[in-house]
């Protein structure tokens, strides 16, 4: 329904607090280098303008689109050219090209300093001195580092962030109360950002059809009692929400997400029996809860799919009449019967079915041609099952850190051209699949593991896209969204790679390593491991293990020494020489 003033419409729907927060997120996600104060100023100007439009929708400029209003505002930033370079050229364009241009300049790996957590007392003082500014700064810092963070979900994180400070800054032991909560929010936030990044990549790189297929499969697993028409409606609405958020239309996205939550709760009887608790919560919690809700129980009696999708004489007729609807029904029926499969596996099965029908429905005897289509599914199902079994066994044998190291070596040998920080980050995250998923019973392992791996490999893909260095990575990332993981799994050692020149500086360590947290120390060691493999890609597991054991002993020894810096200098030289000898460098 058309509104005279879009900005007034969204301001009224969302309320001032959410409106301001979402505009701040939008601006910070576009102009990731701008100082906080500049963004606050821009947001206040937009908010004051929105209020004039609420008072009189016919007022000057109130009829302009949100993209026009926000783009014009962003283009008033004086330092645009010197801070952002060619992004300033976006301002010469008209809408909608200008917004597309801004979107293309979003940086998944912005050159921003690491967020350092101040002392708890310092944070609590800042929180009490100016709660509003403190929370805005949280939104700003997260949004600029995660330019695709799901905006309405970031509002939920901010609400939890505020609740943590409100509770813990009054506690007897502030740190004991606050720090675990902040750790949890940080870890959940990173996971939420990565999951949303995959949704946006799916929409932007593979199109709406790919996202809708993903959504049909996931919602059918989650709501197996819902009718196909109901699932289709939810998929359409969900696609609109994510298209808007991924496109920078955060006000519309948040508004539509609230409408979707309202619809789901009003119709929960025909959707899922698991929604009751979610639907009693306030809006932000409700939307989050619905997004995370457990799968409903399967209907008591579901027949074999063979009758409708293989044995029926009308298969080709039904397929020809409405291809995507028929394939959607196939995916819905398959997914609701298989909560034990990953979404990407279900999509591979649907793709195989589609390919078979494309071929067979043009054949002389279609039925004879597609009669054994489900036999083709067997290897597709068994491949991830076997892979997960093998890797969970390896994880249980090695523990998380050494399992990550095994993956570091594996992936560095596959794609040694990728930057070391990216290989470390991605392999560490791949390795977390063990503690995240291997504890689950078999029926939950595959959806946990393979769908998580899709999220992590997408991180590799978006980071690599910024600075492409490997044709193999590009190929696996762009050919097929659902086959990314099998594509990377199938990669062998890159025989074309010319080993990196040995540089002693890479393996020179200082006493500062002793004061690092365990996690940061692991990252240092894992960085060295990647560099070793880049120098000697053909090194055996045993050789690498020996060098890494020596390295661990060296760090431990020097961190206990009285003169740490001298120890690192002298013992470091010996370690480098011994490592070179061990690896035949």
């Amino acid at each position: 329904d058309a509104h005279k003033s879009e900005v007034a419409h969204r301001f009224k729907d969302l309320g001032e607090e959410n409106f301001k927060a979402l505009v701040l997120i939008a601006f910070a996600q576009y102009l990731q280098q701008c100082p906080f104060e500049d963004h606050v100023k821009l947001v206040n100007e937009v908010t004051e303008f929105a209020k004039t439009c609420v008072a009189d929708e016919s007022a000057e400029n109130c009829d302009k689109s949100l993209h026009t209003l926000f783009g014009d505002k962003l283009c008033t930033v004086a330092t645009l050219r010197e801070t952002y370079g060619e992004m300033a050229d976006c301002c010469a364009k008209q809408e909608p090209e200008r917004n597309e241009c801004f979107l293309q300049h979003k940086d998944d790996n912005p050159n921003l300093p690491r967020l350092v957590r101040p002392e708890v007392d310092v944070m609590c003082t800042a929180f009490h001195d100016n709660e509003e500014t403190f929370l805005k700064k949280y939104l700003y810092e997260i949004a600029r580092r995660h330019p695709y963070f799901y905006a309405p979900e970031l509002l939920f994180f901010a609400k939890r962030y505020k609740a943590a400070f409100t509770e813990c800054c009054q506690a007897a032991d502030k740190a004991a109360c606050l720090l675990p909560k902040l750790d949890e929010l940080r870890d959940e936030g990173k996971a939420s950002s990565a999951k949303q990044r995959l949704k946006c990549a799916s929409l932007q790189k593979f199109g709406e059809r790919a996202f809708k297929a993903w959504a049909v499969a996931r919602l059918s697993q989650r709501f197996p009692k819902a009718e196909f028409a109901e699932v289709s409606k939810l998929v359409t609405d969900l696609t609109k929400v994510h298209t808007e958020c991924c496109h920078g239309d955060l006000l519309e996205c948040a508004d539509d997400r609230a409408d979707l939550a309202k619809y789901i709760c009003e119709n929960q009887d025909s959707i899922s029996s698991k929604l009751k608790e979610c639907c009693e919560k306030p809006l932000l919690e409700k939307s989050h809860c619905i997004a995370e809700v457990e799968n409903d129980e399967m209907p008591a009696d579901l027949p074999s799919l063979a009758a409708d999708f293989v044995e029926s004489k009308d298969v080709c007729k039904n397929y020809a009449e409405a291809k995507d609807v028929f394939l959607g029904m196939f995916l819905y029926e398959y997914a609701r019967r298989h909560p034990d499969y990953s979404v990407v596996l279900l999509l591979r099965l649907a793709k195989t079915y589609e390919t078979t029908l494309e071929k067979c429905c043009a054949a002389a005897d279609p039925h004879e041609c597609y009669a054994k289509v489900f036999d083709e599914f067997k290897p597709l199902v068994e491949e991830p099952q076997n892979l997960i079994k093998q890797n969970c066994e390896l994880f249980e044998q090695l523990g998380e850190y050494k399992f990550q190291n095994a993956l570091l070596v594996r992936y560095t040998k596959k794609v040694p051209q990728v930057s070391t920080p990216t290989l470390v980050e991605v392999s560490r995250n791949l390795g977390k699949v063990g503690s995240k998923c291997c504890k689950h019973p078999e029926a939950k392992r595959m959806p946990c593991a393979e769908d998580y791996l899709s999220v992590v490999l997408n991180q590799l893909c978006v980071l690599h896209e910024k600075t492409p260095v490997s044709d193999r990575v590009t190929k696996c990332c762009t050919e097929s969204l659902v086959n990314r993981r099998p594509c990377f799994s199938a990669l062998e050692v890159d025989e074309t790679y010319v080993p990196k020149e040995f540089n002693a500086e890479t393996f020179t360590f200082h006493a500062d390593i002793c004061t690092l947290s365990e996690k940061e120390r692991q990252i240092k060691k894992q960085t060295a491991l990647v560099e070793l493999v880049k120098h000697k890609p053909k090194a055996t597991k045993e050789q690498l293990k020996a060098v890494m054991d020596d390295f661990a002993a060296f760090v431990e020894k020097c961190c206990k020494a009285d003169d740490k810096e001298t120890c690192f200098a002298e013992e470091g030289k010996k370690l480098v020489a011994a490592s070179q000898a061990a690896l035949g460098l």
Epitope: D301, E333, D340, F377, V381
Partner: nanobody, 124 residues
């Protein structure tokens, strides 16, 4: 964990009947699609029949349609295969299987638990 034990196999003349039973222990079978498969000497295991969780739907291989009937009694935690008009080509080791999730009923990879099998020999 579900343990499955088949019984009721034996030697029977062509045209005769047998009733196979599959008793489950360790878990209730009402959450599982139950299926029967068979393997003749030197051949691959093949699907025979399957039945949905509450028994509302059944599914048969073309070769046994109209001669075999699958049924289940969830209160007794048992599935059955009534085999009539038996033929020499029905001679095989018959396996009972339970699958928590199944889209196709006929695909062995969708079944989680298997019995040891009971031998059926059809011979004059």
């Amino acid at each position: 964990e579900v343990q499955l034990v088949e019984s009721g196999g034996g030697v029977v003349q062509p045209g005769g009947s047998l009733r196979l039973s599959c008793a489950a222990s360790g878990s209730t079978i009402s959450s599982y699609v139950m299926g029967w498969f068979r393997q003749a000497p030197g051949k691959e295991r093949e699907f025979v029949a399957a039945i949905s969780r509450s028994g509302g739907y059944t599914y048969y291989a073309d070769s046994v349609k109209g001669r075999f009937t699958i049924s289940r009694d969830n209160s007794k935690n048992t599935a059955y295969l009534q085999m009539n008009s038996l033929r020499p080509e029905d001679t095989a080791l018959y396996y009972c299987a339970a699958g928590r999730y199944s889209a196709w009923y006929s695909q062995s990879y969708e079944y989680d638990y298997w019995g040891q099998g009971t031998l059926v020999t059809v011979s004059s």
